[in-house]
Amino acid sequence: QDPYVKEAENLKKYFNAGDPDVADNGTLFLDILRNWKEESDRKIMQSQIVSFYFKLFKNFKDDQRIQKSVETIKEDINVKFFNSNKKKRDDFEKLTNYSVTDSNVQRKAVHELIQVMAELSPAAKIGKRKRSQMFRGRRASQ
Amino acid sequence: QDPYVKEAENLKKYFNAGDPDVADNGTLFLDILRNWKEESDRKIMQSQIVSFYFKLFKNFKDDQRIQKSVETIKEDINVKFFNSNKKKRDDFEKLTNYSVTDSNVQRKAVHELIQVMAELSPAAKIGKRKRSQMFRGRRASQ
């Protein structure tokens, strides 16, 4: 049994998350994950899910009753999702920590927008003509 | 020229993001994107970057001076990053909108944690033995 299971059960007790009413009104993450089979689509969704759990764990980091459980689960996420790659985890953390209300961050983000957009589609590296074929056509002239 | 370029230039003017000092202290996103070549790694990072921009745009959605620019860029992101797939965009939006301080959301998230963790690694579907090999060995028994 993976080590996170026991620790997740401990968190369930702490949050009363084993109660029957928890399942009311559908799932947060599980139904969404079931929708996406392609690895790249799954990563888009899992990225948001992992950042949610990291924020949740941060809010409870000083609670001694669950500290060990939280740390074990975070370690397991680092192995499974980030392939034990600290650089990947660090880059991810940087992205999740930027403040959207900080005017310097806003200016930088807008400054970088054109280059970010140019890289968004998987075929971004193969030039405009090939990418437009991916969109099944070209953009009409303005 | 892709349509977002003109609109991103308009945003640059609005945010004074063309000023030389904007480049001080490194980039927010570009250096991180340069680090990751694998499509699934890029999606992990781009997922966070796109959610940042969506939050930023939400904060300025009522400003008439940039409304058209913001809407054009959002449409372009939907075509390029979400493949014009509204279900993908809707699932993404649901994930970004969950409140980490809502106790019902916390309980649901903890309730789902074991199953989410079980699916985190790319090889989650190919059985325990194969997956453990992907992690370059097995975990020592507890």
């Epitope: 303005q142 | 075509v79 993908k88």
Partner: antibody, heavy 124, light 112 residues
Framework: EVQLVESGGGLVKPGDSLTVSCVAS????????IHWVRQAPGKGLEWVAT????????FYSDSLRGRFTVSRDNANNSVYLHMSSLRGEDTALYYC?????????????????WGRGTLVTVSS | NFMLTQPLSVSGYPGKTIVISCVRS????????VQWFQQRPGSAPAMVIY?????PSGIPDRFSGSVDASSNSASLTISGLKTEDEADYFC??????????FGGGTKLTVLG
């Protein structure tokens, strides 16, 4: 009230070209993707092409790409479908259909609003 | 090649329930929304279900839509069948980037 009105259909010979038009009203036209869908007499529905709203990206059915071109004029609330090298099997009723507003996560449904269609007949 | 396969015809008596299936040949049915359209002779198609299971305003709750990932199919269910429901029904979904796909259509006959 959302309205889409197609025009420009008619009888043409095989090999000829034809442009059909669609004029829209009752909504902010530039916000929405527009689809062209056709229906041959007594047959099912076949998607032809789509053009995005503000960005004007064009998407085509694999079987028609190269012969058909979609374009739009947001200032005049109009979309066009230019068809070249027409064949007998292109004979159909051509519908203009409103798509999503892809900048709005609460957009009205895709393909909710249809025009009445314009009939294109290709025959010698 | 992506296909949405529907039965050619379905029939039922007034007041009964019928189900029209729409099977996706490849790719996951859950990864794209499914819409359903009703088309009466001489009219343009009219949407009866959008985004898997939602009804546009004016469509009675006798019409319902669902998606089943295990069979990779979507279904349109019409309960309390009425003679006015007699029409052709088309499912619709997507593939690739904004590639729209229609099923071949199902002719619904209300018996009696």
């Amino acid at each position: 009230e959302v309205q889409l009105v197609e025009s420009g259909g008619g009888l043409v010979k095989p090999g000829d070209s034809l442009t059909v038009s669609c004029v829209a009203s009752g909504f902010t036209f530039s916000n929405y993707f527009i689809h062209w869908v056709r229906q041959a007499p007594g047959k099912g529905l076949e998607w032809v092409a789509t053009i995005s709203g503000r960005t004007k990206y064009m998407f085509y059915s694999d079987s028609l790409r190269g012969r058909f071109t979609v374009s739009r004029d947001n200032a005049n609330n109009s979309v066009y479908l230019h068809m070249s090298s027409l064949r007998g099997e292109d004979t159909a009723l051509y519908y203009c259909v409103r798509g999503y507003d892809h900048s709005d996560s609460n957009s009205a449904a895709d393909l909710l609003h249809w025009g009445r269609g314009t009939l294109v007949t290709v025959s010698s | 090649n992506f296909m949405l396969t529907q039965p050619l015809s379905v029939s039922g008596y007034p007041g009964k329930t019928i189900v029209i299936s729409c099977v996706r040949s490849s790719g996951s049915v859950a990864s794209h929304y499914v819409q359903w359209f009703q088309q009466r002779p001489g009219s343009a198609p009219a949407m009866v279900i959008y985004e898997d299971s939602h009804r546009p305003s004016g469509i009675p709750d006798r019409f319902s839509g669902s998606v089943d990932a295990s069979s990779n199919s979507a279904s349109l269910t019409i309960s309390g069948l009425k003679t006015e429901d007699e029409a052709d029904y088309f499912c619709q979904s997507y593939y690739g980037n904004n590639q729209v796909l229609f099923g071949g259509g199902t002719k619904l006959t209300v018996l009696g």
